[in-house]
């Protein structure tokens, strides 16, 4: 008789990333008997929830249940019914909810309470909804990319999983950009840190890692734009803001009350003689870059060296994976190739920003205007953040790899979060088992 593989014992896990601009649900699967091996967990589905981030539901919490329905139902379809009850569900909220909590713990609690009640109604093993710290967000993103790149594996391979993977065990740094915060996490050369708040120690698969991490709240691309607008409107002579970060011919009316809604613009808040102002794009990369640089306070540093705003940053070390909005924006601008130098990126940004808005709309007819209008700012912001904020140079630029997925799994904090909460990253290297997970009869 022909040998027939017995059905694998597969496990599933669900993580919801409740970001500032939207929520995404990720479904992961792995062979049960290999759950302590490195690199066996992979993403089988991403479902993007329709609508804004959960922090925007403060005024309409009764709509949260409906908001989550489609993606939770999708999870019900993807995961075999027999596995539902043992499939853990975790929701982690990030900077959008950190900002809401900063304004009001009550409102943040209320949103999370309704989210928890909604998720408890599904047949899965709901493990809770919480606001994760910026440090966790950075650390789990670092764990995710290094897990997927096989950096924790003690077995050196004769092949490369992904084009930029080297066969050495040096970990990649992680650069994460969201709508409301950005994280930088890496293993510095020097293990002593001047700032204990930024230091993390891990023991993973039998190896110790001393990791630097920092999350810059308000420096995600959306909140950075609000900051820039609040800063620039202070010196506007009237209710017209001629803005170099938007394409020539672009026009948009902004409510002052919306501008000052976020704690991120608090330092720029002032009484203005108007309730609304109009952004008029002038599309000038160089001027936009200068305006963005004013968001980074580099004049004060209580350490040997800083990123910006007095935050310690050790010298950059090794390769970095830049994901989430770093990737989405650079991918839209077609600037993710390893061959594109920093000078070339700057040149392309100058060209892109100076293109008339009408031309841009025609060239990218399928893209929502709200998103389309902000790529000039976002691209400029990414360059400014990486070069002036984190001190990458034209030379070290080649060490930045813009990553969307690794081996079919999205780069981001969610996989690392689940691996940690399900205890799937052992401190010690597991003993290798003689049998593979497929048993033949």
């Amino acid at each position: 008789t022909q040998n027939k593989a017995l059905p694998e014992n597969i496990k599933y896990g669900i993580v919801l990333d409740a970001g500032s601009s939207h929520t995404s649900l990720y479904i992961y699967k792995w062979p049960a008997e290999k759950e302590n091996d490195t690199g066996v967990v992979h993403q089988v589905e991403e479902c993007r929830v329709k609508g804004p981030g959960i922090s925007k539901y403060v005024q309409k919490v009764n709509e949260i249940g409906i908001y989550l329905t489609d993606c939770m139902e999708r999870a019900r379809e993807v995961i075999p019914r027999s596995q539902h009850q043992e499939t853990p569900v975790y929701l982690g909220a990030t900077a959008g909810m950190r900002l809401l909590r900063m304004e009001s713990e009550e409102l943040a609690d209320r949103v999370l309470d309704v989210v928890e009640r909604s998720l408890s109604n599904y047949p899965f093993d709901f493990q809770g909804a919480r606001i994760i710290t910026g440090q966790e967000e950075g650390a789990y993103g670092w764990i995710t990319i290094n897990y997927l790149l096989g950096k924790f594996s003690q077995k050196t391979r004769w092949f490369s999983i992904v084009p930029y993977e080297t066969n050495n065990q040096e970990t990649f740094g992680a650069l994460d950009l969201g709508g409301a915060s950005t994280q930088i996490t890496f293993v510095p050369q020097n293990q002593t840190t001047e700032s204990p708040d930024n230091a993390l120690q891990f023991r993973l698969y039998g190896k110790d890692y001393n990791v630097y991490t920092h999350s810059f709240l308000c420096y995600g691309k959306d909140q950075a734009l609000w900051q820039k607008l609040a800063k620039d409107i202070q010196v506007a002579s009237n209710e017209i803001l001629r803005d170099p970060c938007f394409h020539p011919g672009y026009k948009k009316v902004v409510n002052v009350s919306d501008l000052y809604k976020t704690p991120c613009t608090k330092r720029f808040e002032m009484t203005l003689p108007f309730q609304q102002f109009e952004i008029q794009g002038i599309g000038n990369y160089q001027q936009c870059h200068q305006s963005v640089l004013e968001l980074f306070n580099t004049s004060y540093c209580p350490y040997s060296q800083c990123a910006f705003n007095g935050i310690f940053l050790p010298p950059l070390q090794g390769d970095f994976g830049a994901f989430s909005a770093f990737y989405f924006v650079m991918n839209f601008l077609n600037l993710t190739s390893e061959k594109v130098s920093q000078e070339k990126v700057t040149e392309m940004m100058k060209k892109f920003c100076s293109q008339p808005w009408e031309e841009i709309k025609t060239s990218y007819a399928g893209v929502k205007e709200k998103y389309l209008s902000e790529y000039c700012f976002s691209g400029t912001y990414i360059l400014s953040l990486l070069l002036q904020g984190y001190h990458f140079t034209a030379d070290s630029w080649e060490h930045i790899h813009f990553i969307g997925k690794i081996q079919g799994s999205d780069a981001g904090w969610t996989l690392g979060y689940m691996l940690n909460l399900t205890n799937m990253i052992p401190a010690e290297q597991p003993l290798s088992t003689p049998l593979s997970h497929s048993t033949y009869v």
């Epitope: 900063m102 009001s104 713990e105 308000c218 330092r267």
Partner: antibody
Framework: QVQLVQSGAEVKKPGASVKVSCKAS????????MHWVRQAPGQRLEWMGY????????TFSQKFKGRATITVDTSASTAYMELSSLRSEDTAVYYC?????????WGQGTLVTVSS | DIVMTQSPDSLAVSLGERATINCKAS??????????MYWFQQKPGQPPKLLIY???NQGSGVPDRFSGSGSGTDFTLTISSLQAEDVAVYYC?????????FGGGTKVEIK
Amino acid sequence: QVQLVQSGAEVKKPGASVKVSCKASGYTFTDYNMHWVRQAPGQRLEWMGYIVPLNGGSTFSQKFKGRATITVDTSASTAYMELSSLRSEDTAVYYCARGGTRFAYWGQGTLVTVSS
Amino acid sequence: DIVMTQSPDSLAVSLGERATINCKASESVDNFGVSFMYWFQQKPGQPPKLLIYGASNQGSGVPDRFSGSGSGTDFTLTISSLQAEDVAVYYCQQTKEVPYTFGGGTKVEIK
């Protein structure tokens, strides 16, 4: 655990300024606002203002605008409240309190006495 | 400014008996379905301690005998069975809008 530790008692002359510090520990300092509340002897609690440690933006009660300044040193996780042009009615215990809208954690208080 | 009026100014209650303190706001302190109303306990020489937040939620480590109720403009703090250690001044506070304001306080004593 969350702790707010304030500087010691001060005696000041009318017209002088006082600067009270509040050192925070046990949480990410920039994730929560820091408020200042005072209480004159035998009087009700009086909210003065708050700061967003994240960026140094502050808001004050009208009564203290122009006379009170709130600052932070994020590297030291410390907030400061400075009150200028002191008068005898500023004699009070000054408290820092962590919160957005919920003042769950308070400093032990700093007694400021204004006397000629 | 929202004015918070507490009553009574002082209250003497026998041990084990119920104590009720009222607080009236000059305008509603509700927003987005949440009451931005808080109750604090303050003992001599100590900072205030949060008892109740959001009008009816117990603060961390607060005994079950303390409860809060109300919405809009009228709120109540109840101590179901007064204990000796509950002797203190109790304050209500609103944080719906700046300036955040406190009530005048209610002194609770043992009869």
